[in-house]
């Protein structure tokens, strides 16, 4: 046989030879020889690697910082990294999410169009005609106005997109 | 067809010295890694030491590193084993086999080498 | 080093009979072992490698499975030809090691 310039999938070429690579969860210890296949080892505790792999030295896992906000969403094992979540309330400042900020709140003339997420921020949208807000609220969508008329009510003052009609009895015709 | 024929064993006093060599023939020489595997009276097979094809690297079993040194000649389509500092317990019938995917598919009828004073 | 260890060292059986030896190693070496066979006055010859994959020209009576530690050879009808000693071979670690070998005997 020829020496090889390139090898199967799973293999990597070194001294002109084809070694098999270490599968996901175990690190490279010694290149394989002629006489002896590739040697790999598991991943320690706290450690990962998720392909195949010629690495010397594992990955550490994703420490979910509290003080950053953070907690475990899912544990890593020897072939996935933890991924880590924001406390309630909080959401992640970017997708590999390493911090976490407090969800921001909709102020008045805003309601929440979506909810935050522990990944995603909340999404506010301005109270059309017809809707109003009067707090600052992460929960809150815009309310529609009062309608005085099923009420038996006429409109007293106009409502805003950050108040409410005011609503009053009709006026009665005098005799 | 693949022949391989060891030469060289013998009697020789404890601390001496003897070179084997593996005569091959019937195939492609320097394409293949080869090896020399011993088996001592009463005992079983225990590798000795290899040596890579296209001029790759030596290995070469705890008991006799420093001791033993693996060559090829490819023009020559011959193995040796440089065998040095001798002592009884290397007494054994010496095999040279060539390797392909890490199992020793030809090997030869084997030379006995026996230390002793 | 990483220890092989053959049982039976030694078996005795007929012709005909179904023959398992099995062979432990000291630590995992994955699917990274071979057998084979020696007659007395005979060069060894490689029956199974990769724990499994027969040789070629090897009967389809000799069988090799399993991986990690624990490995068996299987044969399945003994033939008098058959009556030899078998080694396992790890090449998981360096150095590669043999077994201390099975003599399978005539009954």
């Known amino acids: 046989p020829e020496p090889p310039t390139a090898c199967r999938e799973k293999q990597y070429l070194i001294n002109s030879q084809c070694c098999s690579l270490c599968q996901p969860g175990q690190k490279l210890v010694s290149d394989c020889t002629e006489f002896t296949e590739t040697e790999c080892l598991p991943c320690g505790e706290s450690e990962f690697l998720d392909t195949w792999n010629r690495e010397t030295h594992c990955h550490q896992h994703k420490y979910c910082d509290p003080n950053l906000g953070l907690r475990v969403q899912q544990k890593g094992t020897s072939e996935t990294d933890t991924i880590c979540t924001c406390e309630e309330g909080w959401h992640c400042t970017s997708e590999a999410c390493e911090s976490c900020v407090l969800h921001r709140s909709c102020s008045p003339g805003f309601g929440v169009k979506q909810i935050a997420t522990g990944v995603s921020d909340t999404i506010c949208e301005p109270c059309p005609v017809g809707f109003f807000s009067n707090v600052s609220s992460a929960f809150e969508k815009c309310h529609p106005w009062t309608s005085c008329e099923t009420k038996d009510l006429v409109v007293q003052q106009a409502g805003t997109n950050k108040t409410d009609v005011v609503c009053g009895p009709q006026d009665r015709l005098r005799a | 067809e693949v022949q391989l024929l060891e030469s060289g064993g013998g009697l020789v006093q404890p601390g001496g010295s003897l070179r084997l060599s593996c005569a091959a023939s019937?195939?492609?020489?320097?394409?293949?890694?080869m090896s020399w595997v011993r088996r001592a009276p009463g005992k079983g097979l225990e590798w000795v030491s290899g040596?890579?094809?296209?001029?790759?690297?030596?290995y070469y079993a705890d008991s006799v590193k420093g001791r033993f040194t693996i060559s090829r000649d490819n023009s020559k389509n011959t193995l040796y084993l440089q065998m040095n500092s001798l002592r009884a317990e290397d007494t054994a019938v010496y095999y040279c086999a060539r390797y392909v995917n890490f199992g020793m598919d030809y090997w030869g009828q084997g030379t006995l080498v026996t230390v002793s004073s | 080093d990483i220890q092989m260890t053959q049982s039976p060292s030694s078996l005795s059986a007929s012709v005909g009979d179904r023959v398992t030896i099995t062979c432990r190693a000291s630590q995992s070496i994955s699917s990274y072992l071979n057998w084979y066979q020696e007659k007395p006055g005979k060069a060894p010859k490689l029956l199974i490698y990769?724990?499994?994959s027969l040789q070629s020209g090897v009967p389809s009576r000799f069988s090799g499975s399993g991986s990690g530690t624990d490995f068996t050879l299987t044969i399945s009808s003994l033939q008098p030809e058959d009556f030899a000693t078998y080694y396992c071979q790890q090449y998981g670690r360096n150095p590669p090691t043999f077994g201390q070998g099975t003599k399978l005997e005539i009954k």
């Open positions: 990769a724990a499994s």
């Open positions: 040596i890579g094809s296209y001029g790759g690297g030596t």
């Open positions: 019937g195939f492609t020489f320097s394409s293949y890694a």
